[in-house]
């Protein structure tokens, strides 16, 4: 995990390469805080890598707004399983209930 | 090539000011926290200063707090070293040197080749 | 501020030998910010490791750090004639200022 933040900012380079979604496993983003008063952007890369990220670049800006929205699209798929599993087990339940009055 | 070349160095006397530059090329200077280390005649490393990629952070060294003011400009690429009210025990090769480049992990990946600063009267 | 202590101050062995650095720090510092330099009479530093275990790009696999909190290892598994040098360990805190230890030189026996 990335560090706390107690006497410095933890960024104090960013990544001079592109970043690509499919390399990426976490992306975190820190609000300005006593001990930094920037906002910070710190991925984790697939392999491993901790980077940070250029806030003001656009590429960045552009990979933030693809990763929430695979974010969310995770959790609605999430949430969607759930869903269905809620009523195979109704399914389920009600199967059982019928065959319980046929014997 | 990635390359760090530090200019401005030279004799001066206790209590006048020098300003150190260091000309970056090859890589992208507006993503590199940058850093000032001298190392005095027979001496180890001293690291002096730190500005961040974007210049907002700026860190010292106890010894050179107050005295000294690091600076970039990334529109020229360059870093600089305000050296004011110099002691004689400043007298050192100056290194300017760039942070590791993810940013995450520390550590100064390429270095200048030095310029000498030596405070005499 | 987190004071670095290196031992020993000098090492003296032969081309072929294991050479084992250690670098002590006063207090806690996080593997990622621990660095490894090697530095050669009338060169600039360069960097060898990176968060405490990382090789930097083109360094030889004979080198490798090691270590965490306050106890930390540089260890050449066969020294070169080209690696006689000093070595400094350099710590990142969460709070500057970032330090450099004192230094190992490493000399031919």
């Known amino acids: 995990t990335p560090v706390v933040r107690k006497g410095r900012c933890s960024c104090i380079s960013t990544n001079q390469g592109t970043i690509h979604l499919q390399s990426l496993k976490d992306l975190k983003q820190f609000a300005p805080s006593p001990s930094c008063e920037k906002i910070e952007i710190i991925a984790t890369l697939k392999n491993g890598v901790q980077t940070c990220l250029n806030p003001d670049s656009a590429d960045v800006k552009e990979l933030i707004k693809k990763w929430e929205k695979q974010v969310s699209q995770k959790k609605k798929q999430k949430n969607g399983k759930k869903h269905q599993k809620k009523k195979v087990l109704k399914v389920r339940k009600s199967q059982r209930s019928r065959q319980k009055k046929t014997t | 090539q990635v390359q760090l070349v530090e200019s401005g160095g030279g004799v001066v006397q206790p209590g006048r000011s020098l300003r150190l530059s260091c000309a970056a090329s090859?890589?992208?200077?507006?993503?590199?926290?940058m850093h000032w280390v001298r190392q005095a005649p027979g001496k180890g490393l001293e690291w002096v200063a730190l500005?961040?990629?974007?210049?907002?952070?700026?860190y010292y060294a106890d010894s050179v707090k107050g005295r000294f003011t690091i600076s970039r400009d990334n529109s020229k690429n360059t870093l600089y070293l305000q050296m004011n009210s110099l002691r004689a025990e400043d007298t050192a090769v100056y290194y300017c040197?760039?942070?590791?480049?993810?940013?995450?992990?520390?550590?100064?990946?390429?270095w200048g080749q030095g310029t000498t600063v030596t405070v005499s009267s | 501020e987190i004071v670095l202590t290196q031992s020993p101050g000098t090492l003296s062995l032969s081309p072929g030998e294991r050479a084992t650095l250690s670098c002590r720090a006063s207090?806690?510092?996080?593997?990622?910010?621990l660095a490894w330099y090697q530095q050669k009479p009338g060169q600039a530093p360069r960097l060898l490791i990176y968060?405490?275990?990382s090789r930097a790009t083109g360094i030889p696999d004979r080198f490798s750090g090691s270590g965490s909190g306050t106890d930390f290892t540089l260890t050449i598994s066969r020294l070169e004639p080209e690696d006689f040098a000093v070595y400094y360990c350099?710590?990142?805190?969460?709070?500057?200022?970032?330090?450099f230890g004192p230094g190992t030189k490493v000399d031919i026996k």
């Open positions: 040197a760039r942070d590791w480049p993810e940013g995450y992990y520390n550590g100064m990946d390429v």
């Open positions: 090859g890589f992208t200077f507006s993503n590199s926290g």
């Open positions: 500005i961040g990629f974007d210049g907002i952070n700026e």
């Open positions: 207090q806690s510092v996080s593997s990622s910010y």
């Open positions: 968060g405490a275990s």
């Open positions: 350099q710590q990142y805190g969460s709070s500057p200022p970032f330090t």
